[in-house]
Every structure is written in C-alpha cells, then in structure tokens.
C-alpha cells in the first residue's frame, strides 16, 4: 500500500494510473467504500462523501490513463485509505495528514517558552525534528518545547515530520519580542545632554502597551520611577514624569529619552520595562549612565567618575601630548600643583577611550612680597 503524507490546509494529489493510455471508467472510494468521485464519459461525477466540495480530478490527464484524486484544504480527518478502481484493478493509497502549530501565538516574549504541537491521525506514530533560525535542532513526539527563547530564535523554524520513512516539512515563523540590546551604557561629561535609545528587535503592524523607566542612582538608597508612558499603535505618550530630572520622550518608535544634562546625582542604572497588550510578561532593557567631572580647586586638579564602571576601567589625568601623570583603576584621581596647560581626564578600557574631559590650568603668578 502506497503511503502519502499531507499537510493540514494544503492540497494533495493521489495518483492512479491505468495500463491503457486512454480515458476509461474509474472511481475513487474511501475505506468505507463510499464513492468520492469518478467519471461518466468525459464528465466528473461526485459521490456522497464528506470530501464532496474539496475533491477534484484532472480531466486533462484522463486521456493519458491518469486519474488523480485531488483533495484541497486538507484536514486531519481526511487521513484514510483511498481506493482507486480502474480496469478491474484496485489501487490503495494511505493518506496521512499532519498539522503543526505553535502554542497560542507565534509572537513570544524573550525568555518565554515555545511549544510546537503536532496534530496527527489516530494510529500514526510520527517523530518530529525542528531546526531553529540559528540552526539549533530539537526532537520530540507529539509536542516539542523550547524554554527560554532568545532573540536569535526569531525567524523561520523548519520542522520535519517523519512517518513510515516518509516526511513532510513545515515552516513556522516565530517572532521573539525583545529589545535589540539587553543592556547599554552611556558615558557623558557633566553638563552634557544624554540620549537613551531603546530600539526593538521586531516590527509589528500595531504595537500597543505601556512602559516605565525605573532609576537607581549610585548616590541614592532606593530606586525611583523617572517616567511612565503609553504606547498606542506605535505612538508614544508620556503619562507621568519626575520633576528632577525632567526627562523628555520622543513621540515615535524607537523609544527615545533625553536627559537635559548629565549630573553626578543621576549617574547609575535604569531598567526600562515595556508591557505589551495581550502579552503576559514584560520586555526589559537595562541602561547605565556614567558621568565624568574634572575640577580644579586651589592646588588640586581632580577627575571623578560616577556610575556603574567595571573594575578594569582606567582613569587617567595627563597634560596634553604628554604621558599620563596619574592612572588608576579607581573612580577618582588627582594631581597636586598641576603644571599650566590643557589637562585631559580619560576613562579608558584596554586603551580605548570611553570618555574624555578637558580642563585648562592657568599659570599661577607668584605675587611679590610688599616691603
């Protein structure tokens, strides 16, 4: 018995060939001997089967002795043994129809689980293997689960269903809802304007939800909500904003926040959360702000940084075009009695400058002693 695998919703063509290359009488029946279709001369006739409106043949092939049964919009319950009767012969074809669907939704938040469920006819024992867009393979029976979805899992999943050494392939598009970056860090000199951007890693027709930026300043004992906002069809509207600092927010995507000026008391880390309509859970992006200040007080030139810096970052003070006078893996460095000239305060990581602040030291003239 020939086995043919079909996909739910697709069209399948079951073949039936006569030895005579001419149009002769044929008919297709199901396993209950109910007629599906046949011919009467050059006319297609249909029987009382449940396939009535979805069954067809190709009249153009009849003259060549080919009498296919075409079933459109396949359903799992179409799985059956189909019998073609032609020239006093019976050809049997077993049709097995499978469906593969993603749990509830194909748009899932980063970190959530994806479950793929196989619909299969009774009595079948298929195996399923799926490949993610990054090439990860998973194997299973009637269900396959992937926990902790990552951004790279966004895209087309290819799944193969194997049954009776035959296979049918499904492609499912999965969208992982996430920010492009899990974390970002902004380095600014004191007084500079700060731009925070939160680009999304996906595009959807309509995007609705609400969000909030919580901020933990390095100098503060607890975190504070800096801004809350709504998102309606990709339009951003601010609901509530603190007075200090008074953040401004862009009205369009990507989510964009502006801090008028970087000050030591704002240095720290924030967590932007975005709750999307009809989704359980939230998207998160961490953002960090490091602020640098260079000051001269009497005979002391000081450079300081505030905010979440890694222990391997180097803070240096140097006179322009000269070697560094002081370099330390600390958050403050200073030089006593600095020479006159343009001094540079540098925050660097393995030689790469992340932040630079210049300060001019004027020459000190010794005042003559009065007689």
């Amino acid at each position: 018995k020939k086995v043919v695998l079909g996909k739910k919703g697709d069209t399948v063509e079951l073949t039936c060939t006569a030895s005579q290359k001419k149009s002769i009488q044929f008919h297709w029946k199901n396993s209950n001997q109910i007629k599906i279709l046949g011919n009467q001369g050059s006319f297609l006739t249909k029987g009382p089967s449940k396939l009535n409106d979805r069954a067809d043949s190709r009249r153009s092939l009849w003259d060549q002795g080919n009498f296919p049964l075409i079933i459109k919009n396949l359903k799992i319950e179409d799985s059956d043994t189909y019998i073609c009767e032609v020239e006093d012969q019976k050809e049997e074809v077993q049709l097995l129809v499978f469906g593969l669907t993603a749990n509830s939704d194909t748009h899932l938040l980063q970190g959530q689980s994806l479950t793929l469920t196989l619909e299969s006819p009774p009595g079948s024992s298929p195996s399923v293997q799926c490949r993610s867009p990054r090439g990860k393979n998973i194997q299973g029976g009637k269900t396959l689960s992937v926990s902790q979805l990552e951004l790279q899992d966004s895209g087309t999943w290819t799944c193969t269903v194997l049954q009776n050494q035959k296979k049918v392939e499904f492609k499912i598009d999965i969208v992982v809802l996430a920010f492009q970056k899990a974390s970002s860090i902004v380095y600014k000199k004191e007084g500079e304007q700060v731009e925070f951007s939160f680009p999304l890693a996906f595009t959807v027709e309509k995007l609705t939800g609400s969000g909030e930026l919580w901020w933990q300043a390095e100098r503060a004992s607890s975190s504070k909500s800096w801004i809350t906002f709504d998102l309606k069809n990709k339009e951003v509207s601010v609901k509530r904003v603190t007075q200090d600092p008074k953040l401004q927010m862009g009205k369009k995507l990507p989510l964009h926040l502006t801090l008028p000026q970087a000050l030591p008391q704002y240095a720290g880390s924030g967590n932007l959360t975005l709750a999307l309509e009809a989704k359980t859970g939230k998207l998160h992006q961490e953002v960090n702000l490091v602020v640098m200040r260079a000051t001269q007080l009497q005979k002391n030139l000081t450079c300081e940084v505030w905010g979440p810096t890694s222990p391997k970052l180097m803070l240096s003070l140097k006179l322009e075009n000269k070697e560094a006078k002081v370099s330390k893996r600390e958050k403050a460095v200073w030089v006593l009695n600095p020479e006159a000239g343009m001094w540079q305060c540098l925050l660097s990581d393995s030689g790469q400058v992340l932040l630079e602040s210049n300060i001019k030291v004027l020459p000190t003239w010794s005042t003559p002693v009065q007689p």
């Epitope: 293997q129 799926c130 490949r131 090439g135 990860k136 393979n137 049918v168 392939e169």
Partner: antibody, heavy 117, light 107 residues
Framework: EVQLVQSGAEVKKPGESLKISCKGS????????IGWVRQMPGKGLEWMGI????????TYSPSFQGQVTISADKSISTAYLQWSSLKASDTAMYYC??????????WGQGTLVTVSS | DIQMTQSPSSLSASVGDRVTITCRAS??????LAWYQQKPEKAPKSLIY???SLQSGVPSRFSGSGSGTDFTLTISSLQPEDFATYYC?????????FGQGTKLEIK
C-alpha cells in the same frame, strides 16, 4: 532514487565570475535544504551555507558570507553557488548535498573549480 | 563557532582490526553529530547521524556513540573497502562545522 547532479569542472581567471549548479531529482526538491561544502586541495570539508529552495531562505557560514551567493530555481529543481570575482584561493572542489535538518544525507559528485592566471 | 577536533589525524591498521576514531566538540552539542566517509576523488558518504544512528545501507560493523562533547566512531572489523578519510560534523548550531578528518591507512 535521490540524485544530486553538479555541473562540470571550471577553469577561470582571477576576477572572473562563475555560477555552478546542482540539480536535484528523485525527491521533493522544495522540501529539503540544500547545502554547499568546500574542499580545498588536500584539505578537509568546510560548511559554506544552505538554501531552502521552497522559499529561497538562506543561511551562510560567517567565513563565506559576502564571498559567495547561494540561490535556487525551484521550477527546475536546481541550486546554485556563485562568485562575482574569483580569487586563486577559491580553487577547490565544491559539493552540494541534501540537508536533512543538518545531516548531509545525499551528496553531489562535486565540481572542481580552478582559478589561475 | 563550535570547533570539532578529531583524533588521531591518521591511523594505520590491518584488515580485521577494531578501530576507534574520536571527535571532540568545543561545547556541548547534545547528540547532533554525523560521521562521513570519503574515499579519494569521491564525494563524502553519510555513515552515522544523531551520534549513533546508522544510515540505511551502511554495514553494521560501523557504530557511533557519545553525547555532549565526546564522540566515537568504531569499525568493529576493518574491511579493505573501509580505508578512507573519516569526518565528524556537528549540526547543533550554525555554522555547522566538520572535524579536520582522520585518514585510515593500510598497515
């Protein structure tokens, strides 16, 4: 019987373009990925990338991204590997293979590409 | 990228010998490993998939084992036609990568 038949050997000059082919038969060509593998003279096998002829979805190895283009014409069950500007270092045997979710279960006979001035 | 390291690089053996080739992945790849045989001037041929499943038509003297990072290909009783180069390949994540090969020669 599953078969992958590749185009014949090619001798080219540096800077020239080239497109080699791989014709599949004996199976549903649009339902399997097709991969390309390079084997430089006296060396091992290198995975270049794959294509799904059903919708021309492609994935490249970072080592070959931008160096070659993989394409397919499902109407004639043929996959292609092409170069816009060949280099002497492209001299190698190139194999196409049917990819059964990562495993290359059937291979073409190989196309030898020689690039020399 | 996941690196695949085969050992030994070459191996001399006699007909009837039991031979083992190992393949180590730079990170865990579950059982997503295949073994191929390549004879001179020929295309590679698939022997084993999913670390231990024998490809249809491949003699039962070939077997594979292992999971995670360490894998082996064993030929229980070497036949004259088995002298060839053997490659392992991971298909756990892109880019799928091959080992450098093990050349099996007649002693």
């Amino acid at each position: 019987e599953v078969q992958l038949v590749q185009s014949g050997a090619e001798v080219k000059k540096p800077g020239e373009s080239l497109k080699i082919s791989c014709k599949g038969s004996g199976y549903s060509f649009t339902g399997y990925w097709i991969g390309w593998v390079r084997q430089m003279p006296g060396k091992g096998l290198e995975w270049m990338g794959i294509i799904y002829p059903g919708d021309s979805d492609t994935t490249y190895s970072p080592s070959f991204q931008g160096q070659v283009t993989i394409s397919a014409d499902k109407s004639i069950s043929t996959a292609y590997l092409q170069w816009s500007s060949l280099k002497a270092s492209d001299t190698a045997m190139y194999y196409c293979a049917r990819d059964q979710l990562g495993l290359f279960d059937y291979w073409g006979q190989g196309t030898l590409v020689t690039v020399s001035s | 990228d996941i690196q695949m390291t085969q050992s030994p690089s070459s191996l001399s053996a006699s007909v009837g010998d039991r031979v083992t080739i190992t393949c180590r992945a730079s990170q865990g790849i579950s059982s997503w490993l295949a073994w191929y045989q390549q004879k001179p001037e020929k295309a590679p041929k698939s022997l084993i998939y999913s670390a231990s499943s024998l490809q249809s038509g491949v003699p039962s003297r070939f077997s594979g084992s292992g999971s995670g990072t360490d894998f082996t290909l064993t030929i229980s009783s070497l036949q004259p036609e088995d002298f060839a180069t053997y490659y392992c390949q991971q298909y756990d994540s892109y880019p799928y990568t091959f080992g450098q090969g093990t050349k099996l020669e007649i002693k």
